[in-house]
Every structure is written in structure tokens, then in C-alpha cells.
């Protein structure tokens, strides 16, 4: 018995070869002996039933002269999975057709962190195995159901699933979109008084995007978090629903989601969590955003540099006179110099030598007041 594997919705070619390599009488039948089609000596294809019943069944007339009489089944259905009989030259050839299909659970657009289930639709009697390869090259193997938990952004793209049955293979391609922000987390470093821009670009594009979102903010100095802004998203248009009075945030009307804080102040330093709930999706997209604010001040004989907000313990805060070695350098959130000499002082926040934030303060000779450029 010859085995042919097919994909639902596509076409399958069931072989039937003559030993004489020339046109001959042949008939294709179902296993219950109902005729499908055949050629009875006049080179004309005769169908075994009404056109509506048999319009998916065909043969390759061009191959008949070469002694090949295939049965073509178009728009394959699961129910086509059965044994077909080719009768020619007083012999019967049995061809088993198995139709398969691989589908993704309910939706191919899934939120980051959710699970993807790939299901193999297979006919009774088959004993397939499936191996699926993710866009990042990760292989998963199993029976008729495969699950991948905790989807990541790199899982977006084309998944290739190979169904193996009796050493024969059939391949399926499924496009999966992982709905997520481009970055899970970001940090904005600003000097006190500067305008702050927060951007939340999405890692996917869809025709219509509808949902609602909110930015909760936990200021370092505050005991509890507070909702800064809530908004709606309709067909990629952003409309603000509610915004806090302090700070006075502004939000862009188009994607990517964009928020502007007029001034970076120490009382705003902290971390926020932007959540976006998409229509018809369970769960939410999240992006963490952090704001670090720097202030350099001179009070009497004390030059101080401070940072507020979520800084890593490995960050270095330094005070140095321009073009000179650092006077003070500590893994702390505040440094100071007593009786600083006159000149342009720099306050630097750095990570392994890379400057993240810089604030300059001019120290005048002792008879005058300091100037902040």
C-alpha cells in the first residue's frame, strides 16, 4: 500500500503507474467500490458522479501517454483521509491518503508571556509525530499537541512544523505574532528642570489597534503608587481619558505611545508601569519605565550633587573640576565637595566609564554667587 500525505486545503497527487508506459484503461475507486473517475479507452476522463460531488477530483491527462494515471484531489478535507483503489491492467493498487493540518490555539496573535499551543489535526488511524521550529531556532517535539509556555518577543515570526508519518514528511508554516512592547524596560536620565520624553514603541504592527492603557507611577519619595494617566486607543488613535494634575503630562495622539513630562523634578523620580489592554485579548502588555533625576547645587561652602530614582548599585557618582581628576567618586546617590575651588564643576553619573548623565555648575570665586549654566 502506498502512503500519501496531504495538507488540508491543498492538493494531493495519488500515484498509479502502468508497467507499459502507455495510455491504458484505468479506474479510481473509493474503498467501498464507488467510482471516482477513470479513462475507458477513448482518452476521455469520465467522472463517477455528479460534477458537484466530484469537482475536487481530477487526473493529469498529460501524464497518461507516459503510463501515469494519478488521482488529483484538490481542496483536501480531513474526510478525504482513506484508502483509494486504482484499477488498471487487471490489478488493483491501494493508495492510503492521510490529510493533516497544524493550527495555533485560537489565535496567532498572542501576548508576551502567554502560551502557544500548536495542534495537529490528524485522521484516525494515523500515528504522526510533530516537530516545530521557532523563528529563533528552538525545536519542540511531541504528539498531536505541542505547547510553548512564556512566549518571548523572539518567538514572533514563522514557525515551521514538520509532521512525520511512516518516514514521510509534510511541512506546515504558521505565522505567529507576539504582542509586546519593543523594550520590557527603559531608563531615562535627566537633569532637574529638563523636559522628559517617554516612548513606548510596540514590537508589532496590526491593521487596527484598539484598547486602553494606564501609566502607574511609584515616585521614590512617595509611599504609594499613583495613576498618572489613563487613555484609550482606537484604530491607532490615542485619546486621553484622565490625567493627574501634578505632573501635567501630555500624550501624543498617534503611535508609538509617547508621553511628555514638562520638567524633571526630584519628586517625580521613580519607576512607572505602562499597561496596555488590547481589545479581544486576555492579559495586558507591560513596559516599565524609570526616571533618574540629577541636581547639582552650591550652598555656602558646600558643592553637592544628588540623584533620585532607581539607580543600580554599580553606578558611580562623581564631582570633578573640568579637565581635572574627579575630586570625589562614590557608588552613592549623593556626593559633595567642601570649599570647592572656582571653575566649571561637572557632576557625572556613569556606568563602567560611560557617562549616563551630566550636570555642570559654575563655582565663582568666594565673593560671588554660583551660576548654573
Amino acid at each position: 500500500k502506498t502512503l500519501v500525505l496531504g495538507k488540508e486545503g491543498e492538493s494531493a497527487e495519488l500515484p498509479c503507474e502502468s508497467s507499459q508506459k502507455k495510455i491504458t484503461v484505468f479506474t479510481w475507486k473509493f474503498s467501498d467500490q464507488r467510482k471516482i473517475l477513470g479513462q475507458h479507452g477513448k482518452g476521455v476522463l469520465i467522472r463517477g458522479g455528479s460534477p458537484s460531488q466530484f469537482d475536487r477530483f481530477d487526473s493529469k491527462k498529460g501524464a497518461w501517454e507516459k503510463g501515469s494515471f494519478p488521482l488529483i484531489i484538490n481542496k483536501l478535507k480531513m474526510e478525504d483521509s482513506q484508502t483509494y483503489i486504482c484499477e488498471l491492467e487487471n490489478r488493483k493498487e491501494e493508495v492510503e491518503l492521510w490529510v493533516f493540518k497544524v493550527t495555533a490555539n485560537s489565535d496567532t496573535h498572542l501576548l508576551q508571556g502567554q502560551s502557544l499551543t500548536l495542534t495537529l489535526e490528524s485522521p484516525p488511524g494515523s500515528s504522526p509525530s510533530v516537530q516545530c521550529r521557532s523563528p529563533r531556532g528552538k525545536n519542540i517535539q511531541g504528539g498531536k499537541t505541542l505547547s510553548v509556555s512564556q512566549l518571548e518577543l523572539q518567538d514572533s515570526g514563522t514557525w515551521t512544523c514538520t509532521v512525520l508519518q511512516n518516514q514521510k514528511k509534510v511541512e506546515f508554516k504558521i505565522d505567529i505574532v507576539v504582542l509586546a512592547f519593543q523594550k520590557a524596560s527603559s531608563i531615562v536620565y535627566k537633569k532637574e528642570g529638563e523636559q522628559v520624553e517617554f516612548s513606548f514603541p510596540l514590537a508589532f504592527t496590526v491593521e487596527k489597534l484598539t484598547g486602553s492603557g494606564e501609566l502607574w507611577w511609584q515616585a521614590e519619595r512617595a509611599s504609594s503608587s499613583k495613576s498618572w494617566i489613563t487613555f484609550d486607543l482606537k484604530n491607532k488613535e490615542v485619546s486621553v481619558k484622565r490625567v493627574t494634575q501634578d505632573p501635567k503630562l501630555q500624550m501624543g495622539k498617534k503611535l508609538p505611545l509617547h508621553l511628555t513630562l514638562p520638567q524633571a523634578l526630584p519628586q517625580y523620580a521613580g519607576s512607572g508601569n505602562l499597561t496596555l489592554a488590547l481589545e479581544a485579548k486576555t492579559g495586558k502588555l507591560h513596559q516599565e519605565v524609570n526616571l533618574v533625576v540629577m541636581r547639582a547645587t552650591q550652598l555656602q561652602k558646600n558643592l553637592t550633587c544628588e540623584v533620585w530614582g532607581p539607580t543600580s548599585p554599580k553606578l558611580m557618582l562623581s564631582l570633578k573640576l573640568e579637565n581635572k581628576e574627579a575630586k570625589v567618586s562614590k557608588r552613592e546617590k549623593a556626593v559633595w565637595v567642601l570649599n570647592p575651588e572656582a571653575g566649571m564643576w561637572q557632576c557625572l553619573l556613569s556606568d563602567s566609564g560611560q557617562v549616563l548623565l551630566e550636570s555642570n555648575i559654575k563655582v565663582l570665586p568666594t565673593w560671588s554667587t554660583p551660576v548654573q549654566p
Epitope: 483521509s81 490555539n105 490528524s122 484516525p124 488511524g125 509525530s129 498531536k144
Partner: antibody, heavy 125, light 107 residues
């Protein structure tokens, strides 16, 4: 533990309808293909229907085609068999059963390993 | 459809003895073949699948053999709990079909 519990059986007149349910517990129902199998009184076993884990691939034995409908609700961990135009010969104990598999290297072996206790359907005037 | 024929229809064996049950398929079913045990008022219990693989929790005294069209279930040393009806089943072609059963009785 893994359990399948059938319900919905009863006495019905010829031409009538019944809906059988099978409640699954102790496993991830949505991962498994499911089946209905029946056994007429004092007789052997007959496979009735087969449904894939997603519910989109369905097969029936010829004697019930057009009269019975198999379905599933993965959110409710339930398998159903809607039986219409019932005949006397449909009288039987109806079992729901789970298709399991084991694998050796790249080869997968499928078998019906877990069965419910059954529910009795009697079609009589 | 594939017809499964079991023999004998009934078999009387004494406890401790060996029992051999046969099943023939009307056409090849490869090794997609199973044996079930059924006791009165209970659901069938899977003993053997893939013609020769014992299901989980099935004692080693049960063994299956064969492929294609001829299959055998052997119970090496019968215990009192083994007296029941045994069914063979093919799952190579739809519809899946069962044999008519072999009743194993105490002699």
C-alpha cells in the same frame, strides 16, 4: 487523578433526542483527542465518533452519520454527543475515552487508555 | 470496514494455567492493535497496545504478539481476577473495530 464521567443517558422514544456529556478532570483536556464508544446490551463494542483536541477534525461511524454530533468545550473540560433521530439499535452503554500516546525515539504510538464508567441510553417506545 | 474475528468465543482454563487468545483481522492493520479486558458492569480496561506493549499498571503475565492480520494475547499464569471478557481492537483504519470478544471462564 485522571477521570472521565459520563452523564445524560436515559430512556427515550424512537425518533427522540438525547445529549450526552463527559466531564474530564485530572489532566489538560484541551491537549487530548477524545472518543465516544458504545456497547449494546450483551453485545460487543462499537466505535461511534472521534474528535481532535481543537474540535475541528471529526469522524463518525457510518451508522450514526447525520444523526449524531460530537463536540467539545475545552474551557469547560467537557465532551458532548448530541444524538438525534434515535433508533432502537442505538440502545447501549456509551463510554467516553481519551486517546493517549507514548513515544519511542521519533515514533509515536496512540491508543485509547482512559475510559469513563459509561452512561446508559435506552431507546424504546 | 475491517472485521476482527476472535477465537475461541469462550475458553475454560484453570487458575495458574496458561491462556492463549487469538484475533484475526480481515486485512492488515500493521501493529495498530490493542487488547482490552472487561468485567461485568465495568468499562473496558486497556491491556496491550501497539500489538505488544503493555499498558501502564498491567502485570507482566499479560503479553501480546503478532502484526499484520494475526494477533495473540497470552496470559502466562491465570489469576482469579483475570476471568473476564477480552476484546481485540484495530486502530489502523476508520472506523476502528473490535472483535466480538472471548469469554475467559474458570474451569
Amino acid at each position: 487523578q485522571v477521570q472521565l464521567v459520563e452523564s445524560g443517558g436515559g430512556l427515550v422514544k424512537p425518533g427522540g433526542s438525547l445529549r450526552l456529556s463527559c466531564a474530564a478532570s485530572g489532566f489538560t483536556f484541551s491537549d487530548y483527542y477524545m472518543n465516544w464508544i458504545r456497547q449494546a446490551p450483551g453485545k460487543g463494542l462499537e466505535w461511534v465518533s472521534y474528535i481532535s483536541s481543537s474540535g475541528s477534525t471529526i469522524f463518525y461511524t457510518d451508522s450514526v452519520k447525520g444523526r449524531f454530533t460530537i463536540s467539545r468545550d475545552n474551557a469547560k473540560n467537557s465532551l458532548y454527543l448530541q444524538m438525534n433521530s434515535l433508533r432502537a439499535e442505538d440502545t447501549a452503554v456509551y463510554y467516553c475515552a481519551r486517546e493517549d500516546y507514548s513515544n519511542y525515539e521519533d515514533y509515536y504510538y496512540y491508543y485509547t487508555g482512559v475510559w469513563g464508567k459509561g452512561t446508559t441510553v435506552t431507546v424504546s417506545s | 470496514e475491517i472485521v476482527m474475528t476472535q477465537s475461541p468465543a469462550a475458553l475454560s482454563v484453570s487458575p495458574g494455567e496458561r491462556a492463549t487468545l487469538s484475533c484475526r483481522a480481515s486485512q492488515s492493520v500493521s501493529s495498530k492493535f490493542a487488547w482490552y479486558q472487561q468485567k461485568p458492569g465495568q468499562a473496558p480496561r486497556l491491556l496491550i497496545y501497539n500489538a505488544s506493549t503493555r499498558a501502564t499498571g498491567i502485570p507482566a503475565r499479560f503479553s501480546g504478539s503478532g502484526s499484520g492480520t494475526e494477533f495473540t494475547l497470552t496470559i502466562s499464569s491465570l489469576q482469579s481476577e483475570d476471568f473476564a471478557v477480552y476484546y481485540c481492537q484495530q486502530y489502523n483504519n476508520w472506523p476502528y473495530t473490535f472483535g466480538q470478544g472471548t469469554k475467559l471462564e474458570i474451569k
